[in-house]
């Protein structure tokens, strides 16, 4: 029986070029967390395994950092990073819990200012 609930940061926004922490928290269950997957749409970003620790997908190694905790830090954000992110908690004996975060990456005010006052 799955009694737990996943709490997430929900809808969040960040500036282009900046960084953001994606956080999920599993509560209301005593189930053992064996692995947490972080995914963007259908792409695997990272895994935190209870035995093996963190594994970052090679294609995201430069821009993804593990933590804090079971969370994930996205760096050097681009507008293409806008979208849905999922934390997938594999637990025993409950099974699989999924949390959703929507990230919107905004053009920074500095970038807008720079574009408006460009030197020819």
């Amino acid at each position: 029986m799955m009694t737990g609930t996943i709490e997430t940061t929900g809808n969040i926004s960040a500036e282009k070029g900046g960084s953001i922490i994606l956080q999920c928290h599993l509560s209301s269950t005593t189930a053992q967390v064996t692995q947490v997957n972080w995914e963007q749409q259908d792409q695997l970003l990272a895994i935190c395994n209870a035995d093996l620790g963190w594994h970052i997908s090679p294609s995201f190694k430069d821009r993804v950092a593990p933590g804090p905790g079971l969370g994930l830090t996205l760096q050097s954000l681009t507008v293409n990073d806008t979208g849905e992110y999922f934390c997938i908690y594999h637990t025993y004996p409950d099974g699989t819990y999924t949390g959703r975060i929507f990230l919107e990456v905004l053009e920074s005010s500095v970038a807008e200012h720079g574009a408006r006052f460009q030197i020819p």
């Epitope: 695997l44 895994i47 395994n49 594999h90 025993y92 099974g95 699989t96």
Partner: antibody, heavy 120, light 107 residues
Framework: EVKLVESGGGLVKPGGSLKLSCAAS????????MSWVRQTPEKRLEWVAT????????FYPDSVKGRFTISRDNGRNTLYLQMSSLRSEDTALYYC?????????????WGQGTSVTVSS | DIQMNQSPSSLSASLGDTITITCHAS??????LSWYQQKPGNFPKLLIY???NLHTGVPSRFSGSGSGTGFTLTISNLQPEDIATYYC?????????FGGGTKLEIK
């Protein structure tokens, strides 16, 4: 090439014990969770046990809990299943399977199986 | 336990046909479904994971779809080597459970 070779099956009387082995090669055994799955004479597949990559935790369905013990020797690249208090309903072909590192419920490679018959 | 009901239990089709096997879960399993192929006298092999993702080396004639409680495996342009029994498996909650299998034969 991933290779899993089971051994140790045979004929055993009800209440008896048997230890199955699975020799693994062609992959980094110590980095993968491993499972035993059985196929009944009626061709139904039943998950039997799973052990984590480092051996720190193991899981069982209620049907075998307390009677079967899964273990591993990462130095020898070998998976084991100790079966005791065997019943006629444990008669099956026992497969050793590797778990996909991304999604723990997926058995991505299987051995050829070893047959266990429980009969008086 | 989550029950996985597969249908049909057996089917016969001609080479080149497109066939569909369905798997119904007794409760919501999100996308946590795999399909396995077991050829006669052989061990099961992973075909599809997470509902629709093809395992390495699996031909694109195989496809999977669905979510929640209803799932399908579709094989297009049926080939002689597709003669096998196909099983679905859920990974939403323990114990992991399999469907009863669908035996595919060629007419």
């Amino acid at each position: 090439e991933v290779k899993l070779v089971e051994s140790g099956g045979g004929l055993v009387k009800p209440g008896g014990s048997l230890k199955l082995s699975c020799a693994a090669s062609g992959f980094a055994f110590s980095r993968y969770d491993m499972s035993w799955v059985r196929q009944t004479p009626e061709k139904r597949l039943e998950w039997v046990a799973t052990i984590s990559s480092g051996g720190s935790y193991s899981f069982y369905p209620d049907s075998v809990k307390g009677r079967f013990t899964i273990s591993r020797d990462n130095g020898r690249n070998t998976l084991y299943l100790q079966m005791s208090s065997l019943r006629s309903e444990d008669t099956a072909l026992y497969y050793c399977a590797r778990q996909d590192y991304r999604y723990p419920y997926i058995m991505d490679y299987w051995g050829q199986g070893t047959s266990v018959t429980v009969s008086s | 336990d989550i029950q996985m009901n597969q249908s049909p239990s057996s089917l016969s089709a001609s080479l080149g046909d497109t066939i569909t096997i369905t798997c119904h879960a007794s409760q919501n399993i999100n996308v946590w479904l795999s399909w396995y192929q077991q050829k006669p006298g052989n061990f099961p092999k992973l075909l599809i994971y997470k509902t629709s993702n093809l395992h390495t080396g699996v031909p694109s004639r195989f496809s999977g779809s669905g979510s929640g409680t209803g799932f399908t495996l579709t094989i297009s342009n049926l080939q002689p080597e597709d003669i096998a029994t196909y099983y679905c498996q859920q990974g939403q909650s323990y114990p992991w459970t399999f469907g009863g299998g669908t035996k595919l034969e060629i007419k």
